[in-house]
């Protein structure tokens, strides 16, 4: 009886694992083995596929074959007993195009209200992704174990910290990788769960802001308690992208070590041009807080995000504010080549009650003012990019009196 050649051959490639699966054509014939040959583009001869010779099952692994993953390859299979079937040729394919990204490795660290997630490629020193190692981005799904309500977080790198969690609560998450340059989305990791710790005695500092004054950076933050000391550390932001390396060498800012105020001032030349992460920690001598949320700090934007300059036209019941480009020394306007939004704070001169307007436009109306009343206005600019959430310092306050009644035209 002639042996039929196997059919329906599937090639599965996950990272550097090459798996072949196929169907037997004739289940009634026992003791059949299967063998594969492969052929590279531009070659006439077929070569025996090591790892896939005389296979008794319907699956084999040819990961040991050192292929050029960007080169097209053709496979053929036949069944063997006393005689052999005809060859069945599999459609040619390029391994890199066919490959899927495997599940990443996940390492979790718990704080009281935060989880640090370290993500590494599932296959260390992968041949398949050797040229793409730094291009991996990850997305994750996280949920409280008790509720199951999922939150998705996209476009994260090999280290990510999730804040504003509840203490003593178990959170579960799964992570998958993506290579956006190749339109590849990977397979989810197994689910990992971790319980946040009991609430720490000292909360972390909050609302960290960087501004520029003269040739210095001024770093400010808020803190709940008095009589504390603080330290500030920085890290190059690009180091969060480094796959497989989870030793983050945070550095101290010398002028911000053991400071007793909720701000510190350090020269601009501490940082070369670039994007950094900053974090602050509080201590009362006995206990230490966890680190604050990390803020992104771009020296380019920070250096040029100056407070806006504005003119006020006073009416009886409103101000018209015209925002112009900020001035550098020498009175030349600064060209800001990124979109900004403006925060305008105004208050009655005799009161502390502040009101706020946020506007994208550069001409703003401040409504509902009382006639013949002195109001003060200050403004600052914010970048609209969520990832580079930067703000200028506030401009100096400008105070103007509204006109008498019935001059609103």
């Amino acid at each position: 009886k002639n042996l039929k050649s196997p059919q329906k051959v599937e090639v599965d490639i996950i990272d550097d694992n090459f798996i072949l699966r196929w169907n037997r054509s004739d289940e009634s014939v026992g003791n059949v083995t299967f063998s594969f040959d492969y052929q590279k583009t531009g070659m006439d001869n077929w070569i025996k596929l090591s790892g896939c010779q005389n296979i008794t099952s319907t699956k084999c692994n040819f990961s040991s074959l050192k292929l050029n993953v960007y080169e097209e390859i053709k496979l053929r299979i036949r069944a063997e007993k006393e005689n052999t079937s005809s060859w069945y040729e599999v459609d040619s394919f390029t391994p890199f195009r066919k490959a899927q990204i495997g599940p990443p490795e996940v390492h979790l660290e718990a704080e009281d209200k935060a989880i640090v997630i370290h993500i590494s490629p599932g296959t260390k020193d992968s041949v398949m992704w050797a040229l793409d190692g730094l291009s991996f981005t990850y997305s994750l799904v996280i949920w409280k174990n008790s509720s199951g309500v999922e939150e998705r977080i996209e476009n994260i790198y090999s280290r990510h910290k999730i804040y504003k969690l509840s203490p003593e609560t178990t959170y579960c998450l799964k992570v998958k990788a993506a290579l956006l340059t190749s339109w590849k989305i990977g397979v989810y990791s197994p689910v990992h769960c971790i319980k946040t710790t009991v609430e720490n005695e000292l909360p972390p500092p909050e609302n960290i802001e960087v501004s520029v004054q003269n040739q210095n950076y001024v770093l400010k933050w808020d803190y709940t308690y008095a009589n504390m000391t603080f330290q500030v550390q920085w890290l190059h932001a690009f180091l969060k992208r480094n796959p497989g390396n989870h030793l983050y060498k945070w550095k101290q800012i010398p002028d911000c070590e053991n400071v007793k105020t909720t701000q510190c001032v350090f020269p601009q030349n501490v940082f070369q041009k670039g994007i950094y992460l900053l974090r602050v920690q509080a201590s009362d001598g006995n206990n230490t807080s966890f680190w604050s949320e990390e803020i992104k700090f771009d020296t380019e934007i920070q250096a040029f995000l100056l407070p806006p300059v504005f003119n006020i036209r006073s009416l009886s019941d409103s101000f018209h504010i015209y925002i112009g480009a900020p001035k550098q020394s020498g009175n030349t306007p600064v060209i800001q080549d990124y979109p900004l939004i403006y925060e305008i704070i105004f208050w009655e001169n005799t009161s502390n009650a502040e009101r706020k307007i946020i506007e994208k436009k550069t001409d703003v109306t401040v409504p509902n003012l009382k006639p013949l009343t002195v109001y003060c206005v200050k403004a600052r600019a914010h970048t609209m990019d969520e990832k580079l959430n930067k703000s200028s310092v506030f401009s100096d306050a400008v105070c103007e009196k509204t006109k008498p009644g019935n001059t609103s035209k």
Epitope: L108, E111, D112, H246, L247, N286
Partner: antibody, heavy 118, light 107 residues
Framework: AVQLQQSGAELVKPGASVKLSCTAS????????MHWVKQRTEQGLEWIGR????????KYAPKFQGKATITADTSSNTAYLQLSSLTSEDTAVYYC???????????WGQGTSVTVSS | DIVMTQSQKFMSTSVGDRVSVTCKAS??????VAWYQQKPGQSPKALIY???YRYSGVPDRFTGSGSGTDFTLTISNVQSEDLAEYFC?????????FGGGTKVEIK
């Protein structure tokens, strides 16, 4: 394979200084922290300090500030511990260790015995 | 300053038993705790990092657990080669305090 090879045992006089070395193979010390740890006979482990060989930044336990100086030479892939004004309290085995991922000390040297005696 | 306390200096166990070595931090250290094994006359060897992650090559009878201030190293199915002193350590980017150590003796 990762290895940390420490210099040989030292017998030194009180008041003198000693410099211990720790040569790494199988990895580049610039990519890690290098730590030094003290252990007196039948006692526990005491962290002395660490260096980031990439830029020379050091951190010391308060107790060893002024007593210990940690340096590194990236060209020879070696970390050093210098101990000054030695007393009998400094008699101990000193270990170097690599600070790896997540800051834990994943590989240790075989230790160097320092004996301070007149 | 953070203090790591291993209250039991000695623990006695038998081959095949299960033993738990405990460590208490003086303040919340999250999950930044490592465990080391030091056999007589040898240098320490890393077993566990980040409270519960085992280093490659470490037998799976060694398990780390805990977070915040209370941490445990459990050795299940104790073997004679587990006779050693075990140290916990708080590890993060700027402070590395060791516990006083717990000697595990085999009966």
């Amino acid at each position: 394979a990762v290895q940390l090879q420490q210099s040989g045992a030292e017998l030194v006089k009180p008041g003198a200084s000693v410099k211990l070395s720790c040569t790494a193979s199988g990895f580049n010390i610039k990519d890690y922290y290098m730590h030094w740890v003290k252990q007196r006979t039948e006692q526990g482990l005491e962290w002395i300090g660490r260096i980031d060989p990439e830029d020379g930044e050091t951190k010391y336990a308060p107790k060893f500030q002024g007593k210990a100086t940690i340096t590194a030479d990236t060209s020879s892939n070696t970390a050093y511990l210098q101990l000054s004004s030695l007393t009998s309290e400094d008699t101990a085995v000193y270990y170097c260790a690599r600070g790896g991922n997540y800051y834990a000390m994943d590989y240790w040297g075989q230790g160097t015995s320092v004996t301070v005696s007149s | 300053d953070i203090v790591m306390t291993q209250s039991q200096k000695f623990m006695s166990t038998s081959v095949g038993d299960r033993v738990s070595v405990t460590c208490k931090a003086s303040q919340n250290v999250g999950t930044n705790v490592a465990w080391y094994q030091q056999k007589p006359g040898q240098s320490p060897k890393a077993l566990i990092y980040s409270a519960s992650y085992r280093y490659s090559g470490v037998p799976d009878r060694f398990t780390g657990s805990g977070s915040g201030t209370d941490f445990t190293l459990t050795i299940s199915n104790v073997q004679s080669e587990d006779l050693a002193e075990y140290f916990c350590q708080q590890h993060n980017s700027y402070t590395y305090k060791f516990g006083g150590g717990t000697k595990v003796e085999i009966k």
